[in-house]
Amino acid sequence: SERCDDWGLDTMRQIQVFEDEPARIKCPLFEHFLKFNYSTAHSAGLTLIWYWTRQDRDLEEPINFRLPENRISKEKDVLWFRPTLLNDTGNYTCMLRNTTYCSKVAFPLEVVQKDSCFNSPMKLPVHKLYIEYGIQRITCPNVDGYFPSSVKPTITWYMGCYKIQNFNNVIPEGMNLSFLIALISNNGNYTCVVTYPENGRTFHLTRTLTVKVVGSPKNAVPPVIHSPNDHVVYEKEPGEELLIPCTVYFSFLMDSRNEVWWTIDGKKPDDITIDVTINESISHSRTEDETRTQILSIKKVTSEDLKRSYVCHARSAKGEVAKAAKVKQKVPAPRYTVELACGFGAT
């Protein structure tokens, strides 16, 4: 056969579906690889072919579209399972071709088991809600296209294992779940179970997502430098190790670029001919506010180093701040024993 543009195994779309539930999987060619859609391809005389490789096998085989009750079917660019079985797990390939053109892509499909509390190996999407921000909603994801708009499904929401009924600040509203005022206590996994009829059968769709309550943009402030500060003086003798921590608090801001850096005498530490090392650590609060600490270290400080200006800088999407560390040379204590002995002048 002629050469085929092979996009390989598209691991970006590691599709996971629950066992014994319907699944509709669109051929990724049209969504991510080709510049035309299925309708255009079909009207140009191109045919979409599906095949698969079972888990732990090397052999590509055609998909059996003649199973009882049309358990697996194809409709336009969608492969349908009504419902899935555990042994449907494998790598699926969709190939678009005619006599002069060929393009194909493979993707992994994993059929996953869940327990009665919806726990499973499924990778969960994370939805961030702002703390105490007013009404915010999450929507039951990935249920479009499973049933026509004329069908009215029943939707049940759960937090963890518990059906959401008479919760203080969480209200189910069909496909949406409304949080009247999000609090840390609302962190957790939320599941919607969508039940709908089709051809005399009842199907269930289970969708779980993780809700994470984060700092609100209303409360976001420019970076706050906790250290260095005016209360701590770094007093050292030449030859000692100088350690200055720069500790900066950053409010949570979605996708903000948070930066901490040191300057010495207004220059990059690299531009100063001293042996400086800087180590950074990062920690997060429950609302994903961030604390970055950069420790500036000079192993054997000289009297010249103790006269330099050490400034910690920080920047986020909210602004930029800087703070100088108070560094000074320790004054040696007077040697009283010698002075007193001389003072008494023994005869």
Epitope: R257, E259, W261, T263, A317
Partner: antibody, heavy 120, light 107 residues
Framework: EVQVVESGGGLVQPGGSLRLSCATS????????MTWVRQAPGKGLEWVAN????????HYVDSVKGRFTISRDNAKTSLYLQMSSLRAEDTAMYYC?????????????WGQGTLVTVSS | DIQMTQSPSTLSASVGDRVIITCRAS??????LAWYQQKPGKAPKLLIY???NLESGVPSRFSGSGSGTEFTLTISSLQPDDFAAYYC?????????FGQGTKVEIK
């Protein structure tokens, strides 16, 4: 003198892979964030990815997530971009750039670019 | 993602003219903005960072101003060497979006 030189571009088929390299000299490489920026023919600039000084943080534009991997070798003072599942829309001049030290995020030194063409 | 909108997209001017290019961010980026100049077939060159800081070696006829969402690049007296494309770029948030560019051409 700061020098930034890209290499590794070329013609590749859709779905193929390519690894771009960026050799640098004249500055303390390990102290700077590094970045890749691309420019499709006749189009504007698009930030692609960047990597922190020690490689502990990497960020990507959405359109390349899962397909491109940025990496660095501080001993060799080099930056890399591994590109896979390439598409026609990845065709562009790829620039390697150093991010400014003071607060990072802007690009103060650029290479002359290496051209990547994705076509069957 | 933050959108950066530059205007105008093309600007016709003469040598000696005062030229102003504006850049608007879809949300506040504080002062996390840079401006670049690019000539055909060449790599971009940094002109301004932190909204108003002039990069060393850049002529003083270039200046930047603004904060939050509105920014401007001003060329006080356009020189023959200044006919080029100009881009703004925000770096307060990932990803580091560029404006679509402004081409300054000879009138």
């Amino acid at each position: 003198e700061v020098q930034v030189v890209e290499s590794g571009g070329g013609l590749v088929q859709p779905g193929g892979s390519l690894r771009l390299s960026c050799a640098t000299s004249g500055f303390t490489f390990r102290s700077y964030w590094m970045t890749w920026v691309r420019q499709a023919p006749g189009k504007g600039l698009e930030w692609v990815a960047n990597i922190k000084q020690d490689g502990s943080e990497r960020h990507y534009v959405d359109s390349v997530k899962g397909r491109f991997t940025i990496s660095r070798d501080n001993a060799k003072t080099s930056l890399y971009l591994q590109m896979s599942s390439l598409r026609a829309e990845d065709t562009a001049m790829y620039y390697c750039a150093r991010e400014g030290y003071y607060g990072s995020g802007y690009f103060d030194y650029w290479g002359q670019g290496t051209l990547v063409t994705v076509s069957s | 993602d933050i959108q950066m909108t530059q205007s105008p997209s093309t600007l016709s001017a003469s040598v000696g003219d005062r030229v102003i290019i504006t850049c608007r961010a879809s949300q506040s980026i504080s002062r996390g903005l840079a401006w670049y100049q690019q000539k055909p077939g060449k790599a971009p060159k940094l002109l301004i960072y932190k909204a108003s800081n002039l990069e060393s070696g850049v002529p003083s006829r270039f200046s930047g101003s603004g904060s939050g969402t509105e920014f401007t690049l001003t060329i006080s007296s356009l020189q023959p060497d200044d006919f080029a494309a100009y881009y703004c770029q925000q770096y307060s948030y990932y990803s580091h979006t560029f404006g679509q560019g402004t081409k300054v051409e000879i009138k």
